[in-house]
């Protein structure tokens, strides 16, 4: 799996989308988990509704929400009020029994708010991640 980079601004919301094959993953619940390091374990943050037919209903854990378009094959995760500590590796997963298939590996990057003048002299202009030569960046 390549890693897709999603960049958001501190204090704002960031929407992460994970496309998948709706037929292959028919009937499966989905989850969003946080990975501790590039090779670390993935800790569940939030999962879709217990009843697969109700996967379109938004489920929330703290500032993270998840909803699944099971027909269109798109899992959407929203991180509200993005903070520096939200940065890191995540995975979108498709669940079956006690197993989980990775739909997408995601690196969330948190950019300083350009309107926050506390750091005006030290603004970071995002560049291509040195760790992911083939990473796909989405804003």
């Amino acid at each position: 799996h390549n890693t897709t980079v999603f960049q958001g601004v501190e204090g704002q919301s960031l929407q992460v989308s994970c496309p998948y094959d709706s037929m292959k993953h028919w009937g499966r619940r989905k989850a969003w988990c946080r990975q501790l390091g590039e090779k670390g374990p993935c800790q569940r943050v939030v999962s879709t509704h217990n009843l697969w037919l109700l996967s379109f209903l938004r489920r929330r854990n703290g500032s993270t929400a998840i909803t699944d378009d099971t027909l269109g094959g798109t899992l959407t995760i929203t991180l509200r009020n993005l903070q520096p500590h939200d940065a890191g590796f995540y995975q979108c997963q498709s669940l079956h029994g006690s197993e989980a298939d990775t739909l997408r590996k995601v690196l969330v990057e948190v950019l300083a708010d350009p309107l926050d003048h506390r750091d005006a002299g030290d603004l970071w202009v995002p560049g291509e991640s040195e760790s992911f030569e083939d990473a796909h960046v989405e804003h």
Epitope: Q35, G37, P84, H85, W124
Partner: antibody, heavy 120, light 107 residues
């Protein structure tokens, strides 16, 4: 018990090469990145490079590029660091270090260190 | 390469003192900073990862804060076993880089 055990101290002549080993026990090295860090006498820590034993991919600090080779043998759970064209300023303690990589690894294991002395 | 600058390079303190060490990164590194403690003749030990997360088994008197380019390690009440050298290390990009170290000595 999770640990990294390194090979013993070495004394080398300038221009020679040294190969230090680091054997993991209690965990599988494929699940980690293995880094090499050195520390000259009375100095700070200096990162040299890493290997992903799962696929053999390695990355080196520009300062050591071309002079250092990091390898791993998953069958024996051992990583190796070879430094060539040794000079006196390479005299240092060399540590191997295992973690889950960048971006917030919670795992962190270190070897006991191997003293390499370069002297004519 | 990202340069990491620690200050002070050394400090003298007494048992019970509150000690603060700072680390400045030459580029934005978000929260990808670790703090290590090293005692003479020993390998470094991880104290803090991801700028503010306490590693397993590390006493709660240690804390970390900061994001972006400026970070702080605080020891709320210095204990005899805390006299050591402390290093920050950035874990955002390779090559990983360490600060030059801060030696905490007994006053």
């Amino acid at each position: 018990q999770v640990q990294l055990v390194q090979s013993g101290a070495e004394v080398k002549k300038p221009g020679a090469s040294v190969k230090v080993s680091c054997k993991a026990s209690g965990f599988s090295i494929e699940d980690f990145y293995i880094h090499w860090v050195r520390q000259a006498p009375g100095q700070g820590l200096e990162w040299m490079g890493w290997i992903d034993p799962e696929n053999g991919e390695s990355k080196y600090a520009p300062k050591f590029q071309g002079r250092v080779t990091i390898t791993a043998d998953t069958s024996t759970s051992t990583a190796y660091m070879e430094l060539s064209s040794l000079r006196s300023e390479d005299t240092a303690v060399y540590y191997c270090h295992a973690d889950h990589g960048n971006y917030g690894s919670t795992m962190d294991y270190w070897g006991q260190g191997t003293l390499v002395t370069v002297s004519s | 390469d990202i340069q990491m600058t620690q200050s002070p390079s050394s400090l003298s303190a007494s048992v019970g003192d509150r000690v603060t060490i700072t680390c400045h990164a030459s580029q934005h590194i978000n929260v990808w900073l670790s703090w290590y403690q090293q005692k003479p003749g020993k390998a470094p030990k991880l104290l803090i990862y991801k700028a503010s997360n306490l590693h397993t088994g590390v006493p709660s008197r240690f804390s970390g804060s900061g994001s972006g380019t400026d970070f702080t390690l605080t020891i709320s009440s210095l204990q005899p076993e805390d006299f050591a050298t402390y290093y920050c290390q950035q874990g955002q990009t390779y090559p990983r880089t360490f600060g030059q170290g801060t030696k905490v000595e007994i006053k």
